[in-house]
Interface confidence: low
Amino acid sequence: FNISGCSTKKLLWTYSTRSEEEFVLFCDLPEPQKSHFCHRNRLSPKQVPEHLPFMGSNDLSDVQWYQQPSNGDPLEDIRKSYPHIIQDKCTLHFLTPGVNNSGSYICRPKMIKSPYDVACCVKMILEVKPQTNASCEYSASHKQDLLLGSTGSISCPSLSCQSDAQSPAVTWYKNGKLLSVERSNRIVVDEVYDYHQGTYVCDYTQSDTVSSWTVRAVVQVRTIVGDTKLKPDILDPVEDTLEVELGKPLTISCKARFGFERVFNPVIKWYIKDSDLEWEVSVPEAKSIKSTLKDEIIERNIILEKVTQRDLRRKFVCFVQNSIGNTTQSVQLKEKRG
C-alpha cells in the first residue's frame, strides 16, 4: 500500500548500555475528529460517512505493523522477520536495545472498513542511540520499585537529571493508556497500591533548528513489600528422625520460606555430617513452589538411590540462608522395624 499519505512521527530511544531496557511504539492512529489525512479527499459536511473510519481506541486493537527497509525493498511484516519485537494489540514492544532497531515502522488497521481508510496509517521514524558517557551518570533506572503502602515516585529516566523547573512538559502512559493529569518528569504516588505496577512510558519533545522529535523512555514499575527482617524458616522436614527401609530409594525434601528481599539471593542446600566430617551433596536444582508478594517457598530434594547402613549413621542437614541469616534442620535416618 502507498505510505506517502501516512502521518509521520520521529522518535528517539537513548538506551543505557549498563542495563536491560525495553521500548514501545504505539500505533497512534488519528482520531476521526482530528484527522484530515485519514480521508482520501476532504469531504463536505453532507458527505461525511455515517460511521467514521476510526472510533478511537476500540478500533485500534487490530493493527498491522511493518518495517520499511532502508534499501527501498517492500515493507516487511514485523511478526515474520523480527523475533525480538512483539506486537501486543496496538503496541510494538522491543525486548532488547540496540542501534539495529533504528528504522521506519508503519502501522495501519488490518481491516479496511471504508474507502476513506486507505491512507490511514502512521509512520514512525525511530532513531536508537547508546547513551554517551557525558549523559547524566545517575539517571533513573528503567526498572523502578514502589513500596506498597508508602509514598513513592516514578521518574522519567531521560529527564531524571533535570530539576522540575527545567523539565519540559512530559506525556505519560501506563500500560499504553494516556495519564492525562501527569505532565512533569516525575509521577508522585501518594499511596502505593498494587495496581501502580505496570509499564510506564514518558515522552517529551526535543527540537533543533531543523526538526523536532519525541524522546521516549520506558519504565517497568514493580510494587513490592518492604524487605524481610527475618531469616528463612524451614517448613519441611519438621521431624529430626525419619523411618526408612534399607536398600530402598529415598527422597528427602527441604522446603523453606524466604521473606521478600529486593535483592534476592536465597541459598538452600543439603550437606551430610558423618562423625567429624561434613560435605555438601550434589542435589537437583532448587525450585520455587509458591510465590506471593511477601514471601517465596523454595524446595530442594536430596535423593538416595539406595539407603545403606552407613546412611543410618549420618545426619542429613538442610541449610537455608538469606541476607539476614541462616537456619538448619537435620534429619537422622532410622531403620523401619517389622
Epitope: 506498597l148 503502602g149 495519564l179 497500591y193 511477601k294
Partner: antibody, heavy 111, light 112 residues
Framework: SLEESGGRLVTPGTPLTLTCTAS????????MTWVRQAPGEGLEYIGF?????SPYYASWAKGRFTISRTSTTVDLKISSPTAEDTATYFC?????????WGPGTLVTVSL | DVVMTQTPASVEAAVGGTVTIKCQAS??????LSWYQQKPGQPPKLLIY???NLASGVPSRFKASESGTEFTLTISDLECADAATYYC??????????????FGGGTEVVVK
C-alpha cells in the same frame, strides 16, 4: 465531606445516574469508590475510578454500572435497574483507605 | 476472586469486656485490609487501614493484627457506643477482572 444525590423511586429498566459531590476538598486527585447496601444487608463493593478517569468494577458489577467523573463530581450510572438494585448507594474517598463517606442516597426499583 | 469470610456473624459482650472479630481471606492479600464500623442509618466509618493502622480519631481500644491470611479486630474496654456492625474490606487486586465483593459479611456487636 461527600454527598450523594439522584436516588429515587424508578421502574425496572429505567436508567438512573447518581452523583457524588465533594465539599472542603477537590475530588481531582482522589480515587473514588462506590459501595451499596440493600435494606438490612451487608456492604457490597461496586467499583472505583482513578484520578485519570479509568474505572474498575467488581466482577458482578461489570456491564450493569458505569462510573465516570468530571472535575467536581463522580457519577454512577445504573444502566438497567432491577428490584435487586434497591439499596442505599454510598460514595467514598479512597480505595485502600476509605476515609470519607457520604451519607448515602436511596434507590428504590419497583413497578 | 478473593473471598472474605468474617466470623462470628454476631457477638454479645458486657460493657468493659473484649470482643474479637476475625476475617479470613481465601488467598494472600498482603496487608490490604480495612475495618469499618457502621451504625444504623449511618455510612461506614473507617477504623483501621492497611491491616493494623489506626485511622485518625479512632480510640486505641481498637486494635487489629494480621497473621498470613487471617486478620483480627479486637475491641477492648467495650463501651455502649461500640454497639454496631463491623465489616472487613479487602482492597487487594481491585483492578483484576475477577475482583468480587470486597467486604466480609459483617459482625453485629451487641453491648450489654
Amino acid at each position: 465531606s461527600l454527598e450523594e444525590s439522584g436516588g429515587r423511586l424508578v421502574t425496572p429498566g429505567t436508567p438512573l445516574t447518581l452523583t457524588c459531590t465533594a465539599s472542603g476538598f477537590s475530588l481531582n486527585n482522589y480515587y473514588m469508590t462506590w459501595v451499596r447496601q440493600a435494606p438490612g444487608e451487608g456492604l457490597e463493593y461496586i467499583g472505583f475510578i482513578d484520578p485519570y478517569s479509568s474505572p474498575y468494577y467488581a466482577s458482578w458489577a461489570k456491564g450493569r454500572f458505569t462510573i465516570s467523573r468530571t472535575s467536581t463530581t463522580v457519577d454512577l450510572k445504573i444502566s438497567s435497574p432491577t428490584a435487586e438494585d434497591t439499596a442505599t448507594y454510598f460514595c467514598a474517598r479512597g480505595v485502600a483507605v476509605g476515609d470519607i463517606w457520604g451519607p448515602g442516597t436511596l434507590v428504590t426499583v419497583s413497578l | 476472586d478473593v473471598v472474605m469470610t468474617q466470623t462470628p456473624a454476631s457477638v454479645e459482650a458486657a460493657v468493659g469486656g473484649t470482643v474479637t472479630i476475625k476475617c479470613q481471606a481465601s488467598q494472600s492479600i498482603s496487608d490490604y485490609l480495612s475495618w469499618y464500623q457502621q451504625k444504623p442509618g449511618q455510612p461506614p466509618k473507617l477504623l483501621i487501614y492497611r491491616a493494623s493502622n489506626l485511622a485518625s480519631g479512632v480510640p486505641s481500644r481498637f486494635k487489629a493484627s494480621e497473621s498470613g491470611t487471617e486478620f483480627t479486630l479486637t475491641i477492648s474496654d467495650l463501651e455502649c457506643a461500640d454497639a454496631a456492625t463491623y465489616y472487613c474490606q479487602c482492597t487487594f487486586g481491585a483492578t483484576n477482572d475477577d475482583y468480587g465483593n470486597a467486604f466480609g459479611g459483617g459482625t453485629e456487636v451487641v453491648v450489654k
